[in-house]
Amino acid sequence: ESLGWDIAELQLNHTGPQQDPRLYWQGGPALGRSFLRGPELDKGQLRIRRDGIYMVHIQVTLAICSSTSTSRHHHPTTLAVGICSPASRSISLLRLSFHQGCTIASQRLTPLARGDTLCTNLTGTLLPSRNTDETFFGVQWVRP
Amino acid sequence: ESLGWDIAELQLNHTGPQQDPRLYWQGGPALGRSFLRGPELDKGQLRIRRDGIYMVHIQVTLAICSSTSTSRHHHPTTLAVGICSPASRSISLLRLSFHQGCTIASQRLTPLARGDTLCTNLTGTLLPSRNTDETFFGVQWVRP
Amino acid sequence: ESLGWDIAELQLNHTGPQQDPRLYWQGGPALGRSFLRGPELDKGQLRIRRDGIYMVHIQVTLAICSSTSTSRHHHPTTLAVGICSPASRSISLLRLSFHQGCTIASQRLTPLARGDTLCTNLTGTLLPSRNTDETFFGVQWVRP
């Protein structure tokens, strides 16, 4: 681990209560193909333990969704990945709207610091799929 | 190669016969910008030769497609990437539907083992583009 | 830097004049979370300084966009990432159309050589968002 190869791939555990837009994640071989090697989970949110530049990636699929599902709703469904704590470093890193689609997927490189907690906020009232091949979230340390 | 930097980027060769949903891939500098450095192709399917955690990525674009093309058809067009052999390790790793779009693209981290063969199944009856900048599939070893 | 860990993550600076479909990028900690560590910018275009296989990724979101925005226009809005110079190596690496969506995001592995300049061409007449969490472009050296 001293190489700094911190890496994690998480699967969706559950959504938050009504006023909490955060997705709650889980990881570990017992759960399937998810894992945490370096980063850790704090109440379902991913916390970074090593400074560096990370590749952050995510895919979220809406449950029992058709192309009309997303257009039926008045409020757009949007997924944002950001640093939510510490508050001094709070920032949105990656944001996507579903529009007439049922899946969003993206990735980006970003500097993260030890202690940064990443939150994935799903706004709107559509439930995400918990299928492990449809909804997942991961980070990979790529360099100091 | 002893560093374990196994890596491959493939381009679409052809689709399978009617009852075979698999896409058949090809790779090599003579074909363009595709390559195999470590992994190998077995009848158009990608076989892993080194254990580790891999970043798997894919983009598939449907041929001569407009936003109405995908909604014309009764059956949804879906792309699934999975381990198809050995049978004991068969699992879907990544799944996306086209809905009213013409391209899907995603990526994920997943543990793979030597001998795992990855299949990319395109269900539905729409022909994928063979343009090398529109349809491609790759893996990158990222850590043990 | 001798490890060859060249890496860059850029944010959108501006679009080109009317007949120039290229997006112009900027990077640096003073601008936010964008950075250049190895590659460099030449008039807003990304130039590679080290040979190798790179993971290229991009996300582009159209400004003030709804799912009807993209279908309103006669000409499709398409994003292409390619090597634009030197002319002898000019090629399209990655191409996506927006169709009825407002965001495209993808990634691929590709060999790049020192001196290759990457261009991101946005065809159509829709303005991209300059929000740093909605539109970004990056490369990561992954192996020789």
Partner: antibody, heavy 120, light 111 residues
Amino acid sequence: QVQLKQSGPGLVQPSQSLSITCTVSGFSLTSYGIHWVRQSPGKGLEWLGVIWSGGSTDFNAAFISRLSISKDNSKSQVFFKVISLQANDTAIYYCGRNSYYGNLYAMDYWGQGTSVTVSS
Amino acid sequence: DIVLTQSPTSLAVSLGQRATISCRASKSVSASGYSFMHWYQQKPGQPPKLLIYLASNLESGVPARFSGSGSGTDFTLNIHPVEEEDAATYYCQHSRELPLTFGAGTKLELK
């Protein structure tokens, strides 16, 4: 085996409408699109329109105002109608199954054809 | 609309020889790594029969003496060796965009 059988009148009065039914067997209309093509000595083969497995339609712009295509999946029937026929609409009308790939737009099986004469 | 021009309009070929039919499109019908050109055979009193799809792919059940080639705007159907049952009219059809259009046909007769 795959079959497409057409039924419809052979003679139509000018300004009247033409209705043809294409009844299919050996496959489901929820999986395949059905094209309509006509053939006349003067104009050769002309593509008229298609109804897709999902029920949506595409038409040749030259006929869009006169043409309708619908279907009943449960009865495996496709209904084709042209209004305001004139003498130059005299032709053999065919239904044809879209090939396996939905975006290929080639016809791999055809009906036997309905010979239509427009005359008073 | 894309116009397809077939040549020749008719040809006579001896049994066992090669028949070559050309189809030229008014603009490219190649896209997405494919050529969206198809070939049909039609005998009197019968509907057309699909022979070749995507320029060079043989439809199931069609004899291997039929072959297709070409890309962009220029396409060719070859029959070799020609057999008696090949006497028919041959049509090209594109599917690059709507509307689909057909060539005017080439009538193949046996000498």
